[in-house]
């Protein structure tokens, strides 16, 4: 049975005023807007989750990534740090500011072609290897030029929202991130109260579409804070 308690899901790329979070172990979680699956969290363990400001990149803002604030510092203590600009050192794509990606340990500009649903196959920039993105590019185009130029469709694995087609965002889905639809008017959204507090969420919803914001549904004003239903509404 579908559960009517609509209270999980978060998204990394929330425009301001939608930063922050919610989500509790054992709460219902949803993968499709408005559709919930009870007890989704029973498959999750969080033994190694530390209650610090962030555990993963998607818990930070668009221009941030999650890491230990000190070099060689305690791996458990992680906070959201400002993204690295072009030509700065990096270890993964999320460390680089939007419009850039991590290649051979350096943030470089990502021209439109570089991203699609299965990003890493093209961007073979693993640091111990000599393959560069351009090598990957020349190899891939002959094999699958159609896929190379298309951005990720709904259900495709992604690293950030720019990997997804128009109308989709890149959001957490259990232990991966996939392209999901940006929310439409009337759809349930997640209003985050405090940045970096949604570590327990196993799904993320996208943000509300253009011209919409995530607000308490009018007839839910009387409800207790924890059960207030937020939906995407016109400004």
């Amino acid at each position: 049975t579908l559960n009517s308690v609509l209270n999980s899901n978060a998204i990394k790329n929330l425009p301001p005023p939608l930063g922050g979070a919610a989500g509790h172990p054992g709460s219902a979680v949803s993968a499709a807007p408005g559709i919930l699956y009870p007890g989704g969290n029973k498959y999750q363990t969080i033994d190694n989750y530390q209650p610090y400001p962030c555990a993963e990149d998607e818990e930070c803002g668009t221009d941030e990534y999650c890491a230990s604030p000190t070099r060689g510092g305690d791996a458990g203590v992680q906070i959201c740090l400002a993204c690295r600009k072009r030509r700065k050192r990096c270890m993964r794509h999320a460390m680089c500011c939007p419009g850039n990606y991590c290649k051979n340990g350096i943030c470089v500009s990502s021209d439109q072609n570089h991203f699609r649903g299965e990003i890493e196959e093209t961007i073979t920039e693993s640091f111990g290897n000599d393959h560069s993105t351009l090598d990957g590019y020349s190899r891939r185009t002959t094999l699958s030029s159609k896929m190379y130029h298309t951005k990720g469709q709904e259900g495709s694995v992604c690293l950030r929202s720019s990997d997804c087609a128009s109308g989709l965002c890149c959001a957490r889905h259990f232990w991966s991130k996939i392209c999901k639809p940006v929310l439409k008017e009337g759809q349930v959204c997640t209003k985050h109260r405090r940045k970096g507090s949604h570590g327990l969420e196993i799904f993320q919803r996208c943000y509300c579409g253009e011209g919409l914001s995530c607000r308490i549904q009018k007839d839910h004003h009387q409800a207790s804070n924890s059960s207030r239903l937020h939906t995407c509404q016109r400004h």
Epitope: A31, R92, H173
Partner: antibody
Framework: QVQLVESGGGLVQPGGSLRLSCAAS????????MTWVRQAPGKGLEWVSG????????YYADSVKGRFTISRDNSKNTLYLQMNSLRAEDTAVYYC????????WGQGTLVTVSS | DIVLTQSPATLSLSPGERATLSCRAS???????LAWYQQKPGQAPRLLIY???NRATGVPARFSGSGSGTDFTLTISSLEPEDFAVYYC?????????FGQGTKVEIK
């Protein structure tokens, strides 16, 4: 190119333990969630466990919860599956695969639980 | 748990023929979070389709996926000798991730 190589399988007695490893190459390991799937001889595929890119989030099938532990060492580009209290029904080929729909798979490693 | 039922269990066809494999979910998936895999004896599975209809890298155009809700289809437009194998569908909407029991495509 993307490569996943499992190791650590073998024959073990019921109640015993085994640790499987999966060495990854050809992609930025910590960008991707990883998955373990198993296949009993002559049977279909069964999801076992998943872990997020940083290792902060782990998930298990009910059949292995409390007995198996998934982990990863991103500095070594390696995924692990620690299997304790093994049972005869855990006998299977264990595959590691990348992401939630498995776009790349290892060749598998056979785990046989028998007395 | 979402149960995926594949039909038929076995499909006997000749090279050049069209193969249509069905995967039915016990609950509406609402989103296209369904993948198809091909597995040959002694080998690991290989991803063919993800997101219900997106062909994975390097997969020939004769393979196509379609469907939504509870009914999904994998179509092989013209069977090649190397296509005779077992095919599995998998949903990744909710946990536990589940696979269909498989459809074996064999040479007639």
């Amino acid at each position: 190119q993307v490569q996943l190589v499992e190791s650590g399988g073998g024959l073990v007695q019921p109640g015993g333990s085994l640790r499987l490893s999966c060495a990854a190459s050809g992609f930025t390991f910590n960008n991707y969630g990883m998955t373990w799937v198993r296949q009993a001889p002559g049977k279909g595929l069964e999801w076992v466990s998943g872990i997020s890119g940083s290792g902060s989030y782990t998930y298990y099938a009910d059949s292995v919860k409390g007995r198996f532990t998934i982990s990863r060492d991103n500095s070594k580009n390696t995924l692990y599956l620690q299997m304790n209290s093994l049972r005869a029904e855990d006998t299977a080929v264990y595959y590691c695969a990348r992401t939630i729909y498995m776009d790349y798979w290892g060749q598998g490693t056979l785990v046989t639980v028998s007395s | 748990d979402i149960v995926l039922t594949q039909s038929p269990a076995t499909l006997s066809l000749s090279p050049g023929e069209r193969a249509t494999l069905s995967c039915r979910a016990s609950q509406n998936l609402f989103s296209p979070y369904l993948a198809w895999y091909q597995q040959k004896p002694g080998q690991a599975p290989r991803l063919l389709i993800y997101g219900a209809s997106n062909r994975a890298t390097g997969v020939p155009a004769r393979f196509s996926g379609s469907g939504s809700g509870t009914d999904f289809t994998l179509t092989i437009s013209s069977l090649e000798p190397e296509d005779f194998a077992v095919y599995y569908c998998q949903q990744y909407l909710t946990l536990p991730l589940t696979f269909g029991q498989g459809t074996k495509v064999e040479i007639k």
